[in-house]
């Protein structure tokens, strides 16, 4: 499997909520001995590799925001810590995987990365990520609602070697 980012850019007004989305593509192993670790973090566009740097989202680390579940299960962050920061990550049965950020501020602008790790027999088997940019705008030029820009077919499949 690999990770697709349906949208590469989200442009939102201050105060709005946004849901950033990643999706698993291709055959996914859902065996009883397989679990998936999914998480989100902020990063910067490195010259060598995007998403190599892991920075917190609203002071929450990728460990705070992670989902850990079997291949056939849905999951979402229910802990108070994330919700107190206006964040919630979720995953469904169909490979869709998202983080919702509430009440956006200008400080939320930046590069966001989703990370999926397939774990079998308690060790990392396969690791992929996707990247997208969030721009929060204010003033008269800001849109009234979030505007999303589809990724090009090549950009939508961000692949990183394990």
């Amino acid at each position: 499997f690999k990770v697709a980012t349906p949208y590469s850019l989200y442009v939102c007004p201050e105060g709005q909520n946004v849901t950033l989305t990643c999706r698993l593509l291709g055959p996914v192993d859902k065996g009883h001995d397989v679990t998936f670790y999914k998480t989100w973090y902020r990063s910067s566009r490195g010259e060598v590799q995007t998403c190599s740097e892991r920075r917190p989202i609203r002071n929450l680390t990728f460990q705070d925001l992670h989902l850990h579940h079997g291949g056939h299960q849905a999951a979402n962050t229910s802990h108070d810590l994330a919700q107190r920061h206006g964040l919630e990550s979720a995953s469904d049965h169909h490979g869709n995987f998202s983080i919702t950020m509430r009440n956006l501020t200008l400080l939320d602008s930046g590069l966001y990365c989703c990370l999926v790790v397939e774990i079998r027999h308690h060790h990392s088997e396969h690791r992929v990520h996707g990247a997208m940019e969030l721009q929060v705008q204010t003033g008269k030029d800001a849109p009234s609602n979030c505007v999303v820009y589809p990724s090009s077919s090549q950009d939508s499949e961000n692949i990183t070697a394990a």
Epitope: K2, G26, P27, V28, H32, G71, H72, H94, H126, I159
Partner: antibody, heavy 113, light 111 residues
């Protein structure tokens, strides 16, 4: 855990044939399953797979001639317009992410006039 | 689709010796490491030895090892034993359609 193929037999060219793969010890709802064939004295040739969502993926040469489907307990390989070049042992395998870790013993399909 | 070339097609080794089999893909395998190795004996199905280029499958002897990345991979059998006589196949996994391609096989004869 085991995988076993059945349905292989001697057929004449042009005859359709469906092979069945029966699994035990694990659920098809959680496993990707593939078909691979091997002509007598030759190497392994990948045909295609069906994933846990029921989506199928085929080798380019196999598209249109082979159809993989599944029920809750079996995976089928439907073959149309068989020719003598399709004579082979057909293997069913459980596919993890990028490799086959559990294979059946194979079933022989012989196409001859 | 990718073409996978295995060399040599046949190799002879003495008991206790070392065998090296090469596998070259015409295009990079997915993630640069989605390459597996199988052992097949006459009348039997393939048996998984190595997955993701270098990971030893559970229950397989540590005399087998895999290495490589991208398009070039190697299977090494050290301390060859009589039971290692078989045909060995590599298989690349490719994300442009999610398909596998097998190499042509290498027959290992143990003297």
């Amino acid at each position: 855990q085991s995988v076993e193929e059945s349905g292989g037999r001697l057929v004449t060219p042009g005859t359709p044939l469906t092979l069945t793969c029966t699994v035990s010890g694990f659920s098809l709802s959680s496993a990707n399953m593939g078909w691979v064939r091997q002509a007598p004295g030759e190497g392994l040739e990948y045909i295609g797979l069906i994933d846990t969502d029921g989506t199928t993926y085929y080798a380019s040469w196999a598209k249109g001639r082979f159809t993989i489907s599944r029920t809750s307990t079996t995976v089928d390989l439907k073959m149309t317009s068989l020719t003598t070049e399709d004579t082979a042992t057909y293997f069913c395998a459980r596919l993890r992410t990028g490799y086959g870790d559990l294979w059946g013993p194979g079933t022989l399909v012989a196409v001859s006039s | 689709q990718a073409v996978v070339t295995q060399t040599p097609s046949s190799v002879s080794a003495a008991v206790g010796g070392t065998v090296t089999i090469s596998c070259q893909s015409s295009q990079s395998v997915y993630n640069n490491n989605f390459l597996s190795w199988y052992q097949q004996k006459p009348g039997q199905p393939p048996k998984l030895l190595i997955y993701r280029a270098s990971n030893l499958e559970t229950g397989v002897s540590s005399r087998f090892s895999g290495s490589g990345s991208g398009t070039q991979f190697t299977l090494t059998i050290s301390g060859v034993q009589c039971d290692d006589a078989a045909t060995y196949y590599c298989a690349g996994y490719y994300s442009s359609g999610w398909y596998y391609t097998f190499g042509g096989g290498t027959e290992v004869v143990v003297k």
